[in-house]
Each structure stands twice: as C-alpha cells, then as structure tokens.
Interface confidence: low
Amino acid sequence: EVQLVESGGGLVKPGGSLRLSCAASGLTFERAWMNWVRQAPGKGLEWVGRIKRKTDGETTDYAAPVKGRFSISRDDSKNTLYLQMNSLKTEDTAVYYCAGSNRAFDIWGQGTMVTVSS
Amino acid sequence: DIVMTQSPDSLAVSLGERATINCKSSQSVLYAGNNRNYLAWYQQKPGQPPKLLINQASTRASGVPDRFSGSGSGTEFTLIISSLQAEDVAIYYCQQYYTPPLAFGGGTKLEIK
C-alpha cells in the first residue's frame, strides 16, 4: 500500500524552528517529485514548495511566503522527505501535508499540525 | 505567478443532479510541447487530506468514479459531477502544476440542497 506519513509537528514560539519529516512506503520514492502543501485552519490549500528527484538535480522551488525561511530536502536511501522551517511566524500555523507527485499530486499524507504561538 | 480563481465559492445541488465547478488561470497552463494542460482537480472531505480526482485537465485518476469529468484548455477549466451522490459532499480545488509557484484555487464547497 502506498503511504506517506508526516511527523514532527507541534507547538513552537514565533521565531522558532521545526523540522518535519515525511516517510514514504509502497512507492518508488526516488522517482517522485515531492511537495509540501499546507492548510491553515478553515482555509484553502497553499503550496509550500517541492524538491525534484535526483536525476533532475534535486532542484527545489518555494512559495514566496516561505522562501529563505523554509528548506526542503530528501534522503532517497531512507525514503524520507524533510521540511526545515526556520524563523516561524504565527501565519505559518497550519496542517502540513507532504504530497508525492507524478506531476499532479497523486499521493498525500494525513498531515501534521504546526502551531506557531507565543 | 499564475493565479487560480474558482467559482462559485459554494454550491448546493440536489442528489442525482449535475454539479459544475469552474476554474480560471491567469495565464495558460497548456504546454505546447505536448499539447497537455497541467491542471488538476482535488476533492477534500472534512478531516481528510485532499485526493487527486483529475489530472491533465481531463484524465481521471485511478479509482475515481466516472461521474467525475474534467474539461477545458488553456485558461478555463470545468469539473462536472454528472449525478451528485451524498459522498461527494466536499471542497473541490483546482491546481496548476505548469510552473512554480504551483497554485491552488480558493476551493468550491459542494453541499446537498
């Protein structure tokens, strides 16, 4: 069964850091372009960023609100995707989903909640 | 950046009736190199992650019932549910994956009349 499982969410103070993980199973992880998408409480979906696969240079792209603060990486040997979040702001409070893609986002995790509050 | 605009924001449809959701992109998401539209539709039910319904504007994802269909090209797209079922109550999002930053529409909440 294809599965993505996020972890690492929690409560953090503004200015703090958090690292999210997304463990993949049942798919050829190294082939997938992997994305992070977030959803603030009661709001719509917002794309955070993506990392391409190794053969495409593991290039990363980010949405403007997180550029320079968030960093996406992957470890294909562990089938794991990461989101390093620094300088967190209250507006970063959201459920964070990882989504595996064959271009469109075919597979989604269940999400992990990140709350940024003093 | 490409902006995705969905309409309507919410929609109430009777069971068995047809539901139509529209999505407009601020620039074309049609890639001339292969004549494909990089446009997807997702369904999100309460408390669940989104689920891919349609990619390439009109290709149903595996396991998606055939009452769901997508159409359109370039900048204007439509998701149609031909005969609404109770389990279709959800929020529907369109998304362009033509170029980063990838963008979702604001969502259309579909409920039963």
């Epitope: 050829t28 190294e30 082939r31 696969r53 190794k54 053969t55 495409d56 064959n102 | 292969n34």
Partner: antibody
C-alpha cells in the same frame, strides 16, 4: 514480477519501415519511462530515446530523430518503436528497457532482432 | 554529449580474483552512473545504480564506487558465471550514453 515481452525477429528490405512492440506486465505501466536501446552486432549499447507513458511524452537521442518514433498504448500496456527508411546500418538487436530508477534501466526486454537486407 | 570511456577493453581473470573495472565520464556526472552486465546472448541487467547503490538480487561480490568523472566496478571474488561484458552508463544528462564495455573472460 516485472516482464517486458518484445515482438519477434524482423527481416526487412532497405527503405522499408518496421514497428516492434514491447508488452509490459507486473507493474503500473504509466508510472515509469520506457527506453529503447540499440545494439549492433558485437557492439556496445546506444540509447535511442524514451517515452513517458503517463503523458506520451518522448525524448530522443539526436542520432535517432527522424529514424525512430516511440509510442505507447496504455490500454494494452504496450510500448512501440517504429523505424523508418531502413538501411543496413539499422540491422541490430533493439531492446526496450524500463526506468524504474530514473535514467537507469532496471528491467530489459529479451530484444528484437531487425535485419535489413535486399 | 557525455562520452563514457571504459578500461580495460578486455580483462582475463581466474576464479576467485578480485577485479576492478574502470569507467570515466568526459565531464562530471556526480554519482549518476549505472553499471550493467551482459552475458552472451542475453539482455543486459542492472548491477549497480547511482555509482554505489546495490540492486536487489545482485550478488554482494559486486560493488561500485566513485563520483564526479571516475568510477569503478569491483568484483571481489570472481565466479565463472561473471563472464560477460560490463557497461557503464551516464544517467546525468540526455542523451543517456554507455561506455564501449569491458569484456570479462576467464584465463
């Protein structure tokens, strides 16, 4: 178990065209690129190109542009390669090869021998 | 195009020998280098991916190393069934390119 079953040997006259097939089984056909590789008698391997069944996109080695056309039929999980304007230089064994690992060739068909002779 | 150069062209070995096959890329390809074995009258098969990653079902005597432009395939104790031609492949840039091969034979 992944299997790639290629069509049988072909004997063609110069100037003719030939279309060889590669029927895939044991995996989700649309998920991975299908490569085609040429091997002349006693020679090394030469990559012709690949087709991405998900979209039908193709990438070709410049040396084979205009010579080879790669297509797929998703309904039958079959990849095809057509070679046109055949000359003796086209006599070779042609392999289809599946890229489960991006830009590597994890699984190979048994090869199809094409002989071009007057 | 990236040119892949393999050496030696032929290698004569005795069962139990440790052997090293060399592959050089005409420009840096990081670790996007794959190795294949082709036995007589058979299709090639993938031995090593990304320079050093092992493949399920491939005996542990096969290992790979290298990065950038210089790569090595090692067979730590050659078996008679290892006779064949070994090819390296650039997986970095299109067109994908193969080396000319190293023929491994028994003395």
């Amino acid at each position: 178990e992944v299997q790639l079953q290629q069509s049988g040997p072909e004997l063609e006259k110069p100037g003719a065209s030939v279309k060889i097939s590669c029927k895939a089984s044991g995996y989700s056909f649309s998920d991975y690129n299908m490569n085609w590789v040429k091997q002349g008698n006693g020679e090394s391997l030469e990559w012709i190109g690949y087709v991405d069944p998900y979209y039908g996109d193709t990438r070709y080695n410049q040396n084979f542009k205009g010579k080879a056309t790669l297509t797929v039929d998703k309904s039958s999980s079959t990849a095809y390669m057509q070679l046109k304007s055949l000359t003796s230089e086209d006599s070779a064994v042609y392999y289809c090869a599946l890229s489960e690992t991006p830009r590597a060739m994890d699984y190979w068909g048994q090869g199809t021998s094409v002989t071009v002779s007057p | 195009d990236i040119v892949m150069t393999q050496s030696p062209a032929t290698l004569s070995v005795t069962p139990g020998d440790r052997v090293s096959l060399s592959c050089r890329a005409s420009q840096s390809i990081s670790d996007y280098l794959h190795w294949y074995q082709q036995k007589s009258n058979e299709s090639p098969r993938l031995l090593i991916k990304y320079a050093s990653q092992s493949i399920s079902g491939i005996p542990s005597r096969f290992s790979g190393s290298g990065s950038g432009s210089d790569f090595t395939l090692n067979i730590n104790s050659v078996e008679p069934e290892d006779v064949g031609v070994y090819y390296c492949q650039n997986g970095h840039s299109l067109p994908l390119t193969f080396g000319a091969g190293t023929k491994l034979e028994l003395k």
